[in-house]
């Protein structure tokens, strides 16, 4: 997150981190039920660990943290390169969470976000637009949902109904490492960090997010059948 601020501890209890090896954070994720996470399909890896209830970027133990393994990764069947439509993936964890003030699921929005809606994006991604400077703690940023027209004008031929744009204030954006993390509007999960331009946080190059209102049925059906 570029030019965000430290999240309040436990203010994003649905925020998850996907880790490679001992502690290499490579994507964000969102807790949507006691045993299921959502992340971006482009975050798929064969082996990873899941960390919930953690505020710091570092591996130092925190009392609210809970660690899990992913036992099933189910990317949306429509995700493909190079268009990046349908950029979402369900992850089933090896056990259910212990519900606490640090770890709680978030409800997915059934209605699509409208232009001007204020939302919160969060993550441990890089805080510099073109270099890997990672934050000490989880970062939060208020962003505004942009019109479909403005979104398509920013990225001609690259936007479809499975995406929405938000942000667009120069110097503020999600960035590398935030992928798969939550965009929460009015207390409900509206999107996932999907993609954007490089360097991050450029004028007229807003962040592009997976439009989760289009996938409520697929998410419910997939969880029920697995």
């Amino acid at each position: 997150i570029v030019n965000g601020s430290d999240c309040q501890k436990d203010a994003q209890p649905w925020q998850g981190a996907l880790l490679l090896g001992p502690n290499k954070l490579y994507c964000g994720a969102v807790l949507i039920s006691p045993q299921w996470l959502l992340t971006a399909a482009h975050c798929r890896k064969p082996v990873f660990r899941i960390r919930l209830g953690h505020h710091s970027m570092s591996p130092v133990y925190e009392s609210g943290q809970q660690m899990f393994q992913g036992i099933k990764s189910i990317p949306h069947p429509g995700y493909s390169h190079p268009g990046h439509s349908n950029d979402l993936m369900l992850i089933k964890m090896n056990r259910k969470i212990r519900d606490s003030h640090s770890v709680k699921p978030v409800e997915i929005a059934c209605d699509c976000a409208t232009e001007g809606t204020r939302c919160m994006v969060s993550g441990w991604g890089t805080t510099s637009s073109s270099h890997n400077n990672f934050p000490k703690v989880l970062q939060c940023l208020n962003i505004t949902v942009l019109s479909e027209e403005r979104c398509k004008n920013s990225y001609p031929g690259q936007i479809d109904k499975t995406m929405f744009c938000a942000g667009d204030e120069e110097g503020r954006d999600s960035c590398q490492g935030d992928s798969g993390g939550p965009v929460v509007c009015n207390g409900k999960l509206q999107g996932l960090v999907s993609w954007g331009d490089f360097p991050c946080a450029q004028r007229n190059r807003p962040g592009v997010y997976t439009n989760l209102c289009e996938f409520v049925k697929w998410i419910k059906d997939t969880m029920n059948s697995n």
Partner: antibody
């Protein structure tokens, strides 16, 4: 300002291994989220991608050369290297190292363009 | 492999002319296309990335457009220093990264 410099022998015998090194100055090879790329250009011809290595030290090779190519990185020396085995006259070319700059973040991160290049080094394969 | 076809392979133009070079991909590459300029004996130089974004320091007379399979590089008013060979390049998630065959812009 980032600069790249290729080094290695200008003449290699057929069936031997071509070894080149690219030294990165003006920036760290490990601190930035970039790809490090080898490209070659046979005399009077177009550009051919050989392979790339990323910040995870994952390697990506041109399938037409994959069985003969190794790319590695040495962060302590701020260098990355190319080895091409069993060379023939068809491997005679100018070899360039370059930095691959991602075209975006997230789902767009694995797509890149080469924004900084070395000046190139000529390698001739001949006995 | 995705094939990149550039046309024309060469062209003659005068200073001040508007020059257009096209690049066609054998399948959709979204906006993942870059353009380079190469002068004799020199390394290529990135001009345009992501089909239409101008690389820092490149004159505004260069512009790029297109998405999917068809792309265009335009030089709005050719300058003496623009006589060179131009290459398009697609950057795939799956290798190989491939270049077009090049377009040589010569003085008429």
């Amino acid at each position: 300002q980032l600069q790249l410099q290729e080094s290695g022998p200008g003449l290699v015998k057929p069936s031997e291994t071509l070894s080149l090194t690219c030294t990165v100055s003006g920036g760290s090879i490990s601190s930035d989220d970039y790809y490090w790329v080898w490209i070659r250009q046979p005399p009077g011809k177009g550009l051919e991608w050989i392979g790339s290595i990323d910040y995870f030290a994952s390697t990506y090779y041109n399938p037409s050369l994959k069985s003969r190519v190794t790319i590695s990185v040495d962060t302590s020396k701020n260098q990355f290297s190319l080895k091409l085995s069993s060379v023939t006259a068809a491997d005679t070319a100018v070899y360039y190292c370059a930095r691959g700059r991602p075209l975006g973040y997230g789902a767009r991160h694995d797509y890149y363009g080469m924004d900084v290049w070395g000046q190139g080094t000529t390698v001739t394969v001949s006995s | 492999d995705i094939q990149m076809t550039q046309s024309p392979s060469s062209l003659s133009a005068s200073v001040g002319d508007r020059v257009t070079i096209t690049c066609r991909a054998s399948q959709s590459i979204s906006s993942y296309l870059n353009w380079y300029q190469q002068k004799p004996g020199k390394a290529p130089k990135l001009l345009i990335y992501s089909a239409s974004s101008l690389q820092s320091g490149v004159p505004s007379r260069f512009s790029g457009s297109g998405s999917g399979t068809d792309f265009t590089l335009t030089i709005s008013s050719l300058q003496p220093e623009d006589f060179a060979t131009y290459y398009c390049q697609q950057s795939p998630y799956f290798p190989p990264l491939t270049f077009g065959g090049g377009t040589k812009v010569e003085i008429k």
